[in-house]
């Protein structure tokens, strides 16, 4: 009775448990009773990252500069190329197939987390006591100026988009 299962580094074909090809190699021919599985290394710019019985290696990912991509890690015969985005841009997906410009935080919002090559800017509304008067991908919310510490008084209240305006204290005549 032929086998119905094989060990993990083997595959079942023609009632034989044949050795899988190791990462970085592709299948040329299946084993027989008397001949071993034949495997060949992947070519330049190709890879296979698992024990396999693939007859073709996968092409390394191309980091297209026209899409704002650049190589973060060069591929090997066992690993794919890893792309990332040019400065100021981030990936649109986990696979990083294209890039978009980092979002800026509008006035009234500050940067909670600066963007990376794989994540966009995270903005947060400026809470009471803080403001942002610029559209920026880097600027946090700034605290209102403390008029008191300058021996001044608030002449105009601050908002989430504007700082307080300080002025001299009224002198008693």
């Amino acid at each position: 009775e032929p086998p119905t299962a094989c060990r993990e580094k083997q595959y079942l074909i023609n009632s034989q448990c044949c050795s899988l090809c190791q990462p970085g190699q592709k299948l040329v021919s299946d084993c027989t009773e008397f001949t071993e599985t034949e495997c060949l290394p992947c070519g330049e710019s190709e890879f296979l990252d698992t024990w396999n019985r693939e007859t073709h290696c996968h092409q390394h990912k191309y980091c297209d500069p026209n899409l704002g991509l650049r190589v973060q890690q060069k591929g090997t015969s066992e690993t794919d190329t890893i792309c990332t985005c040019e400065e100021g841009w981030h990936c649109t997906s986990e696979a990083c197939e294209s890039c978009v410009l980092h979002r800026s935080c509008s006035p009234g919002f500050g940067v909670k987390q600066i963007a990376t090559g794989v994540s966009d800017t995270i903005c947060e509304p400026c809470p009471v006591g803080f403001f942002s008067n610029v559209s920026s991908a880097f600027e946090k919310c700034h605290p209102w100026t403390s008029c008191e510490t300058k021996d001044l008084v608030v002449q105009q209240a601050g908002t989430n988009k504007t700082d307080v305006v300080c002025g001299p204290q009224d002198r008693l005549r």
């Epitope: 299962a5 060990r7 034989q16 448990c17 071993e36």
Partner: antibody, heavy 127, light 107 residues
Amino acid sequence: EVQLLESGGGLVRPGGSLRLSCAASGFTFGSYEMNWVRQAPGKGLEWVSYISSSGETTDYADSVKGRFTVSRDNSKNLLYLQMNSLRAEDTAVYYCARDVFFFDSSGSPGAYGMDVWGQGTMVTVSS
Amino acid sequence: DIQLTQSPSSLTASVGDRVTITCRSSQGIRSSLAWYQQKPGKPPKLLIYGASSLEGGVPSRFSGSGSGTDFTLTISSLQPEDFATYYCQQLNSFPSTFGQGTKLEIK
């Protein structure tokens, strides 16, 4: 130190049940395929069962198929052999053994062998 | 199922002798064969895997050869600690099977 330690053996009546355990230490148990092999008194080695690293694939010798069940708990580093409907001919020392896959980067196919064995636990089936 | 037949079943030899044990498979198993040594009251010990590769820590006086259906284990110069029982095992497909063993005794 890489070690396997079997337990759970003993005297059992024909038709009875027993559960053997094999505690693994000194290596990443969940990455290895495992086997049970037995040896009747004064006799040779007999492969009993196989289990893949995840527990997804199992296989058995014809002599125990339908009566024995192999399982594993990778979180506890334990291998089990549940033995039901025991017969006198199941009397043996039961060993757990680690499957290892040897390969090099030359591209030549790798090879399996059982490189680590426990000391064994004796199972006696008698009335 | 694949049957493995070892010969001889028992063998008497002296320290320093060259000894060869053979293992024949009922069907082709390429090089999916391992050899083990077992001493009384002890578990088996892996000597050779892939028909001819020496397991780490095993003395170089042990060697394996063969492919397909015919395999041999050779001990080039017997040492006192080599007197034991030797088994071949096929790991080509399930069910995995062992040869019946060869008992190597001191003359």
